[in-house]
């Protein structure tokens, strides 16, 4: 009895915080504080975040929800996950595009734009690593093509074309003079 018993809630703890005069229980994720509790250790009046707003964590003092981010169309971004009351929109790149960070020290919150993935097939090369977080990693030339400079050149179909050593090795024959 009296004040010697330890309280079930304490303003210094994580579960309850002093809001206004009282130690109040916080609002759950996805809810904002409409009015603080009006009794010791009571429940605050919490309302669900309106559409296009969110709060990701349990909170004690947020009297409004954060606005959901809009994906940057100019940077070719798309919404991978729509905004909900408890989570912001997750922006990314559509299939066939990859994230190119706009800053050198890239973290999840860094600004970015989407770049179209390299099409190894169009370059007549094998796909070594599929494009997702970074550009496609293309491998050696496809059968029927040989390395020439930076690209892959088609094996000649007649003896009229020249076939240097690398061509001969890949294409299986040497031009006769």
């Amino acid at each position: 009895q009296g004040g010697t018993r330890s309280p079930r809630c304490d303003c210094a703890g994580d579960f309850h915080k002093k809001i206004g005069l009282f130690c109040c229980r916080g609002c759950p994720a996805g809810h904002y504080l409409k009015a603080p509790c009006t009794e010791p250790c009571g429940n605050s009046t919490c309302l669900v975040c309106p559409q296009d707003t969110f709060l990701a964590w349990e909170n004690h003092h947020n009297s409004e929800c954060a606005r959901c981010q809009a994906c940057d169309e100019q940077a070719s971004q798309v919404a991978l996950e729509n905004c909900s009351a408890v989570a912001d929109t997750r922006c990314g790149c559509k299939p066939g595009w990859f994230v190119e960070c706009q800053v050198s020290q890239c973290v999840s919150s860094s600004p970015f734009y989407c770049q179209p993935c390299l099409d190894c097939g169009a370059l007549h090369r094998h796909t070594r690593l599929l494009c997702s977080r970074r550009d496609t990693d293309c491998g050696t030339c496809l059968p029927g093509f040989y390395e020439h400079g930076d690209g892959c050149v088609s094996c000649p179909t007649s003896t009229l074309g020249s076939c240097p050593e690398r061509c001969a090795a890949v294409c299986g024959w040497r031009q006769m003079f």
Partner: antibody, heavy 122, light 111 residues
């Protein structure tokens, strides 16, 4: 030494307005919740307003809600009570009181001023 | 609103004897492990002075002859042994919910 000193009381006609002040010293005013409590001579005490520290939430009983406004100026260490639409039943001695501190608020009032007298009469 | 009823309204006690003042709440003032009742002493021409907070905790500087007890709806302030300077009006106050309310007061006289 903790001190709270009220001022601003006086005679006012029904329907009139008055603003009470409470100057605090000897403690970190901004860290404490504060209240106004009134007392009709030889009668019971009545809590009339409270304001929290930090986030400035305000609270009133129904008897004064919409007519009285409590506020504070932490830079000036001063508590205020703006009273409007005054009635004869608002006649009383008005005390400024500090709420007892601590991590776990108890809402007991540990320091009181000497009070300022408000008379509402035509 | 929680109504606090104090009894007796007034009484006299001989010097050195025990004075017991009762405060009854119209509903429970207990929650979260605490009983939200506080006691004040008021002498003529002076503001109230906090004696006891949360039912039984003695405020700093208050003599140990003052003690408080109770839970739920029934609370008691005891003064023993009573001294001359204890002649005053005593009020209980709750802070279980809004609005905070005070008892009607008990006037103690010393015989």
């Amino acid at each position: 030494e903790v001190k709270v000193v009220e001022s601003g009381g006086g005679l006012v006609k029904p329907g009139g307005s008055l603003k009470l002040s409470c100057a605090a010293s000897g403690f970190v005013f901004s860290s404490y919740d504060m209240s106004w409590v009134r007392q009709i001579p030889e009668k019971r005490l009545e809590w009339v307003a409270a304001i929290s520290s930090g986030d400035y939430y305000t609270y009133y009983p129904d008897s004064v809600k919409g007519r009285f406004t409590i506020s504070r100026d932490d830079a000036r260490n001063t508590l205020y009570l703006q009273m409007s639409s005054l009635r004869s039943e608002d006649t009383a001695l008005y005390y400024c009181a500090r709420h007892r501190g601590g991590n776990y608020p108890q809402y007991a009032m540990d320091y009181w001023g000497q009070g300022t007298s408000v008379t509402v009469s035509s | 609103d929680i109504l606090l009823t104090q009894s007796p309204a007034s009484f006299a006690v001989s010097l050195g004897q025990r004075a017991t003042i009762s405060c009854r709440a119209s509903k429970s003032v207990s929650t979260s492990g605490y009983n939200y009742i506080h006691w004040y002493q008021q002498k003529p021409g002076q503001p109230p002075k906090l004696l006891i907070y949360l039912t039984s905790n003695l405020e700093s500087g208050v003599p140990a002859r003052f003690s408080g007890s109770g839970s739920g709806t029934d609370f008691t302030l005891n003064i023993h042994p009573v001294e001359e300077e204890d002649a005053a009006t005593y009020y209980c106050q709750h802070s279980r919910e809004l609005p905070f309310t005070f008892g009607s007061g008990t006037k103690l006289e010393i015989k």
